[in-house]
């Protein structure tokens, strides 16, 4: 025995954030001495599905063919050689958007903004939820995360920065989520550009506290739950 | 694509109760609040509540409270209607629609409902 | 409950001209929280379920022609059709968002002349 078999490696085509009704296709790599593959999806009962290998045996293909809630989750794969199981891949995530309708994205006072200066983009959900995420795209770190301490569901988070730089300049998306599966996105806002004027330049900005806010019904109109408590929020770049 | 297929036209007499289905494809289900809408013949769009089949919340227009039920079968994807004690002004098209941020982005094709002795 | 009131109930424009349709609201639609007017644009053909056009006031849903356009803010709203084509005949109403019960314009009529 030349101690452990290397574990495999698991990934998603076309990505791991797949849209509902969406095909998605799950592939573990192994080695060529590989004899069967087993997929595991976390919380449901091992294993999720089996597959033989296809040749030249070193890897195995997982067909979703169209994205839904059951399928969003956290995956790990494995596969049987002569001489036993592998150790697991290192994880995938599968995320679903269009779990819940599109949130709003605002920047206030203004998407038009002076270097220097300070802006709040506001994500606003119809529904109460403890997660908002806020993408910006083709940025190196793309995602900032704002999770509810105390399960606290709100209907909007703030994401300050100050001051802007030319660097926050660019276009944002937000999603919602609930807690019970941070792995189930709401569709994603309409797209917000922010135009930031002016030439101070800082390489590193990045916005200063996150905070989660349940509005008075004069303030966010509509939110026929009432009003719900405030919570602290982590902050939490990926 | 998003697709809400309602029930077929009802006839019903004053004082008589109608159950009106509204089945949704083409989305993730639970996570969209369905509306309901009426429309009386020749005239504009009138909004009478809402459910969220993730929770089963409605909320109801104060003119149709006490009337008006609406229920969810997440097994099938189908909102319900009820609307009770059916009077003449009753008599209208009732639509569906999909909540986006509380305004509508998909609607049904309307059922239409006629209340008459 | 908010009142909404359109204006003119009925309206009769020319192929490829401008029709103008008004919306006028017994509130303020715009939030103070986010800067947004709470309004939306439908148009319902005979015979036909409405249709969304805009949302927000001004922004265009998906798939709507880019002849349609939403203005205006707090309560003064407007739907500009630049250039009348035939498909466009039908009723056109606003909505507010704003607060419950969710209201509508009693509509506005879109005839050709």
């Known amino acids: 025995q030349a101690g452990p078999l290397p574990k495999p490696t698991l990934w998603a085509e076309p990505g791991s954030v797949i849209s509902w009704g969406n095909s998605v296709t799950i592939w573990c790599q192994g080695t060529l001495e590989a004899r069967e593959y087993r997929l595991d999806k976390e919380e449901s009962p091992a294993p999720w599905d089996r597959q033989n290998p296809l040749e030249p045996k070193n890897k195995a293909r997982f067909s979703i063919p169209s994205m839904t809630e059951d399928y969003a989750g956290r995956y790990r794969c494995y596969y049987r050689s002569p001489v036993g199981w592998s150790q697991p891949s290192d994880p995938l995530e599968l995320v679903m958007t269009g779990a819940y309708s599109k949130p709003t994205l605002s920047a206030l006072p203004s998407p038009l903004v002076t270097s220097g200066k300070s802006v709040t983009l506001l994500c606003q959900s119809r529904s109460p939820m403890d997660t908002f995420l806020l993408i910006k795209e083709r940025a190196a770190h793309p995602l900032l995360h704002l999770r509810s301490e105390h399960g606290a569901q709100q209907h909007q988070a703030e994401f300050p920065m100050s001051p802007v730089t030319s660097v926050h300049g660019g276009t944002y998306r937000c999603f919602s989520s609930h807690g019970f599966s941070h792995y189930l996105l709401s569709h994603p806002s309409d797209p917000l550009e922010l135009i930031v004027s002016g030439s101070l330049e800082d390489p590193r900005p990045s916005p200063t506290r996150s905070v989660s806010t349940a509005a008075g019904p004069e303030d966010q109109p509509l939110m026929p739950t009432g009003s719900v408590p405030h919570s602290g929020l982590r902050r939490h770049w990926e | 694509q998003v697709q809400l297929v309602q029930s077929g036209a009802e006839v019903k007499k004053p004082g008589a109760s109608v159950k009106v289905s509204c089945k949704a494809s083409g989305y993730s289900f639970s996570g969209f609040y369905i509306d309901w809408v009426k429309q009386p013949p020749g005239k504009g769009l009138e909004w009478i509540g809402y459910i969220f089949p993730s929770s089963g919340e409605t909320s109801y227009n104060q003119k149709f409270k006490g009337r008006v039920t609406m229920t969810v079968d997440k097994s099938t994807s189908t909102v319900y209607m009820e609307l009770s004690s059916l009077r003449s002004e009753d008599t209208a098209v009732y639509y569906c629609?999909?909540?986006?941020?509380?305004?509508?982005?998909?609607w049904g094709q309307g059922t239409t409902v006629t209340v008459s002795s | 409950d908010i009142v909404m009131t359109q204006s003119p109930d009925s309206l009769a424009v020319s192929l490829g001209e401008r029709a103008t349709i008004n919306c006028k609201s017994s509130q303020s639609l715009l939030s103070s929280s986010n800067q947004k007017n709470y309004l939306a644009w439908y148009q319902q053909k005979p015979g036909q379920a409405p249709r969304l056009l805009i949302y927000w006031a001004s922004t265009r849903e998906s798939g709507v022609p880019d002849r349609f356009a939403g203005s205006g803010s707090g309560t003064d709203f407007t739907l500009t059709i630049s250039s009348l084509q035939a498909e466009d005949v039908a009723v056109y109403y606003c909505?507010?968002?704003?607060?419950?019960?969710?209201?509508f314009g009693q509509g506005t009529k879109l005839e050709i002349k």
């Open positions: 909505q507010q968002y704003y607060s419950y019960p969710l209201t």
């Open positions: 629609a999909r909540q986006a941020f509380y305004y509508f982005d998909s």
